[in-house]
């Protein structure tokens, strides 16, 4: 499963998407910064092997692709770079689901990646809460896509994992 | 290794125009925010632009309002500052400086810094 | 605009001993989000600034543990538990809670 490769270059085509999505300027929104505690803590001091990377990476993407598939965020961003960035979400899904089905012969205890996929889930909760919060205003979708595109960058610090043979 | 090269300064005469360059490497130039800060000779510092990742985004203080543009080449992984009208209160060293990934909470921290390059405006 | 404002020079210390710098803002930098936006930088000599200190009390990367920050939302505190000869320079505070951002005037550390 060659995935480091492919999905470093999916990520960045993502992240160079979600930059240009940018309908608002960031500076007018100052009122409207968010914490919204992505957990890097968690992450940082554990040792992920290949399967574990793949299932939090893939929870990760999937939240996103949900987060960005509702008809708020269609009202939100200009459509074909929606489109295109969906469709890069997509084909990383995909991807990350061939590369779980080759892995298949290696056993994990499925409980070993509950606490990481739990706090990932809880993460865009939070996310989805404060744009409920805030009426999905445009500054509110505009603080969302900077923390979106804070935590893609956060997943190159998984994916060394997926370098590494179980 | 994260660095800011910077080049550009000059002595110029008031009225006149410069541009200043910073050129990065050793991180992904295009998904980071950029400033330029200035330290004039008493050694105040004070900021000067801000330009987001992507470049559609830009903030000056009325001191250099219409006066200063900062730009960027995500190709080239430069940063830009062109400055025109120029005033001798404009005599400062500049630095380039990158903005911390802050996400949603938009930390605008300056996590790395330019060596500085030197504008004197005089006649 | 909000101002910084920030003593010259601090109370000369020696070496080994602790120092504290204090910056003061003109409005409170606590946003409604909890974070604080203070920052903390110090310049040593002939060199560029460097950050020490984000969100008033988290120490950037490679700072030493001696470098600590605290305060209220208007009045900061910058302590260095150990001064040290490397840590000669000017420390700047400054604040990223509105455009445009400012920066104190800078407080040289003075060593006895």
């Known amino acids: 499963c060659d995935l480091p490769q492919t999905h470093s270059l999916r990520n960045r085509r993502a992240l160079i998407l979600l930059a240009q999505m940018g309908r608002i300027s960031p500076f007018s929104c100052l009122k409207d910064r968010h914490e919204f505690r992505f957990p890097e803590e968690e992450f940082d001091g554990h040792q992920f092997q290949k399967t574990q990377a793949i299932s939090v990476l893939h929870e990760m993407i999937q939240q996103t692709f949900n987060l960005f598939s509702t008809e708020d965020s269609s009202a939100a961003w200009e459509q074909s770079l929606l489109e295109k960035f969906s469709t890069e979400l997509y084909q990383q899904l995909n991807d990350l689901e061939a590369c779980v089905i080759q892995e298949v012969g290696v056993e994990e205890t499925p409980l070993m990646n509950e606490d990481f996929i739990l706090a990932v889930r809880k993460y865009f909760q939070r996310i989805t809460l404060y744009l409920m919060e805030k009426k999905y205003s445009p500054c509110a979708w505009e603080v969302v896509r900077a923390e979106i595109m804070r935590s893609f960058s956060f997943s190159t610090n998984l994916k060394k994992g997926l370098r590494r043979k179980d | 290794e994260v660095q800011l090269q910077q080049s550009g300064g000059d002595l110029v005469k008031p009225g006149g125009s410069l541009k200043l360059s910073c050129a990065a490497s050793?991180?992904?130039?295009?998904?980071?925010?950029m400033s330029w800060v200035r330290q004039t000779p008493d050694k105040r510092l004070d900021w000067v632009s801000i330009?987001?990742?992507?470049?559609?985004?830009?903030y000056y203080p009325d001191s250099v309002k219409g006066r200063f543009t900062i730009s960027r080449d995500n190709a080239k992984n430069t940063l830009y500052l062109q400055m025109s009208s120029l005033k001798s209160e404009d005599t400062a060293m500049y630095y380039c400086?990158?903005?911390?990934?802050?996400?949603?909470?938009?930390?605008?921290?300056?996590?790395?810094w330019g060596q500085g390059t030197s504008v004197t405006v005089s006649s | 605009d909000i101002v910084m404002t920030q003593a010259a020079f601090s109370n000369p210390v020696t070496l080994g001993t602790s120092a504290s710098i204090s910056c003061r803002s003109s409005?409170?930098?606590?946003?409604?989000?909890?974070?604080?936006?203070l920052y903390w930088y110090l310049q040593k000599p002939g060199q560029s600034p460097q950050l020490l200190i984000y969100?008033?009390?988290n120490l950037a990367s490679g700072v030493p543990d001696r470098f600590s920050s605290s305060g209220s939302g208007i009045d900061f505190t910058l302590r260095i538990s150990r001064v040290e000869a490397e840590d000669v320079g000017a420390y700047y505070c400054?604040?990223?809670?509105?455009?445009?951002?400012?920066f104190g005037s800078g407080t040289k550390l003075e060593i006895k």
């Open positions: 400086a990158r903005h911390a990934e802050g996400g949603g909470n938009y930390d605008y921290a300056m996590d790395y």
């Open positions: 050793g991180f992904t130039f295009s998904s980071y925010g």
């Open positions: 330009i987001t990742s992507g470049g559609s985004y830009t």
């Open positions: 409005k409170s930098l606590l946003h409604s989000n909890g974070i604080t936006y």
């Open positions: 969100q008033m009390s």
């Open positions: 400054a604040q990223n809670l509105e455009l445009p951002f400012t």
